[in-house]
Interface confidence: low
């Protein structure tokens, strides 16, 4: 049978099913984890759930062959196989490759550099999240969209604060961190503003080099 790919967020409830109808009046249906470990078997009008890490977390719908898994975790990453024994004695097989990703954590925005350069302000910010394979996008008053973890920009003298948002995302979730910067360029840290949870509907973090050295977080 063909292989279907599914990507889901950890902690969610997942339905593994095939897009086509099951063979009519099949004799037996079995779901396997990594090809050889039985999760559940339907036979003679009964579902039998096997001793496995899925016990208590799965439910089979014999009508459609769908396997419901509650609260999936990254350890559930695997290829799942549904094997059906047809009335004629032949077997049919479908495979689903399940990728479970954690929701991305909230990013920390770190001030790497902030200095006056010819009356302009050079700003280097990095968007940090612990060891994840994610996509980065910076938003704000920028000449173009920046799609990596570091933002470098030079600001002409200005009176108003400028805000920069780093969005980290994977295929199942995204989170934002926003840093607002007020002139002058080398102002004390207190004049930099971390947008609050109320402002953006999610908690963001900001740390500067000094913060790192003093183990102090805003």
């Amino acid at each position: 049978g063909r292989l279907v790919h599914m990507t889901v967020v950890s902690g969610s409830n997942v339905t593994l099913n095939i897009s086509e109808s099951l063979p009519e009046n099949y004799k037996q249906l079995t779901w396997f984890y990594t090809f050889d470990q039985k999760i559940v078997e339907w036979d003679s009008g009964k579902s039998k759930y096997f001793e496995s890490k899925f016990k208590g977390r799965v439910r089979l719908d014999p009508q459609s062959g769908a396997l419901y898994i509650s609260k999936v975790q990254k350890e559930d990453n695997s290829t799942y196989v549904m094997r059906v024994l047809k009335k004629d004695g032949y077997e049919q097989e479908w495979k689903i490759k399940l990728q479970v990703l954690d929701p991305v954590p909230k990013p920390v925005i770190k001030i790497e550099k902030r200095e006056d350069v010819d009356d302009n302000c050079y700003l280097k910010l990095s968007c940090v999240i612990p060891g994840e394979s994610v996509n980065y996008t910076w938003y704000g008053e920028l000449p173009k969209e920046i799609q990596n973890s570091v933002l470098e920009t030079t600001l002409k003298p200005h009176k108003h604060s400028r805000c920069y948002t780093c969005q980290v995302s994977n295929s199942v979730s995204s989170k934002n961190g926003t840093f607002c910067f007020s002139p002058p360029c080398t102002a004390a840290r207190s004049e930099q503003k971390l947008i609050s949870e109320e402002d953006l509907g999610g908690e963001q973090k900001l740390i500067s080099e000094e913060d790192l050295h003093h183990h102090h977080h805003h």
Partner: antibody, heavy 120, light 109 residues
């Protein structure tokens, strides 16, 4: 029409065994599981286990493991339940019941019940 | 083992009234719950399965609802023949087992 007809009342002494039979008619016997449920006087329903008449496979409630035997005779389209080492609190009406088709363990047709008394 | 708790133990109502019987499971049973009616000297009769499906031949005044741990059997307008004991029942696929609630006696007021 579907019918399950059970054997008559039985009286036993403590420590003895009893056999209750359940004769099916009106459907294909081997297509449906037969369950056994007991009900002590004035009490609720207590599931004992099932037998798959097709294969003879059985499954019992933990409480009855080791004391109950369920068998069937497909030529007589009859299921049997044997309970051994009877105690006074085994006195009850014993029912056989048939599975709802393919549903897994909802009981749509019941026998009339067999009263078993246990006393010395 | 999943325990089913029925309430109230006894319900006293008059014909024509609405009856509401409750069944609570100690852990989720999804929709795998049935209701039975038992009259004195008779075998139980299946009324509702999969929480809300009426069994063959059951009058429309009987309805079931709920999922997870909380279930309700409603008799919209009581007829004299509805006064009986009602049991809820759940099925566990593994280990394969059936358990019944302790029953609710519905009596004429």
């Amino acid at each position: 029409q579907v019918q399950l007809v059970q054997s008559g009342a039985e009286a036993r002494e403590p420590g003895a065994s009893v056999r209750v039979s359940c004769k099916a008619s009106g459907y294909t016997f081997t297509d449906y599981f037969i369950h056994w449920v007991r009900q002590a006087p004035g009490q609720g329903l207590e599931w004992m286990g099932w037998i798959n008449p097709n294969s003879g496979a059985t499954n019992f409630a933990q409480k009855f493991q080791g004391r109950v035997t369920m068998t069937r005779d497909t030529s007589l389209i009859t299921a049997y339940m044997d309970l051994s080492r009877l105690k006074s609190d085994d006195a009850a009406v014993f029912y056989c019941a048939r599975d709802v088709d393919g549903s897994g363990w909802y009981l749509d047709f019941w026998g009339q019940g067999t009263l078993v008394t246990v006393s010395s | 083992e999943i325990v089913l708790t029925q309430s109230p133990a006894t319900l006293s109502l008059s014909p024509g009234e609405r009856a509401t019987l409750s069944c609570r499971a100690s852990q989720s049973v999804s929709i795998y719950l049935a209701w039975y009616q038992q009259k004195p000297g008779q075998a139980p009769r299946l009324l509702i399965y999969d929480a809300s499906n009426r069994a063959t031949g059951i009058p429309a005044r009987f309805s079931g609802s709920g999922s997870g741990t909380d279930f309700t059997l409603t008799i919209s307008r009581l007829e004299p023949e509805d006064f009986a004991v009602y049991y809820c029942q759940q099925r566990s696929d593994w280990p394969p087992s059936i358990t019944f609630g302790q029953g609710t006696r519905l009596e004429i007021k």
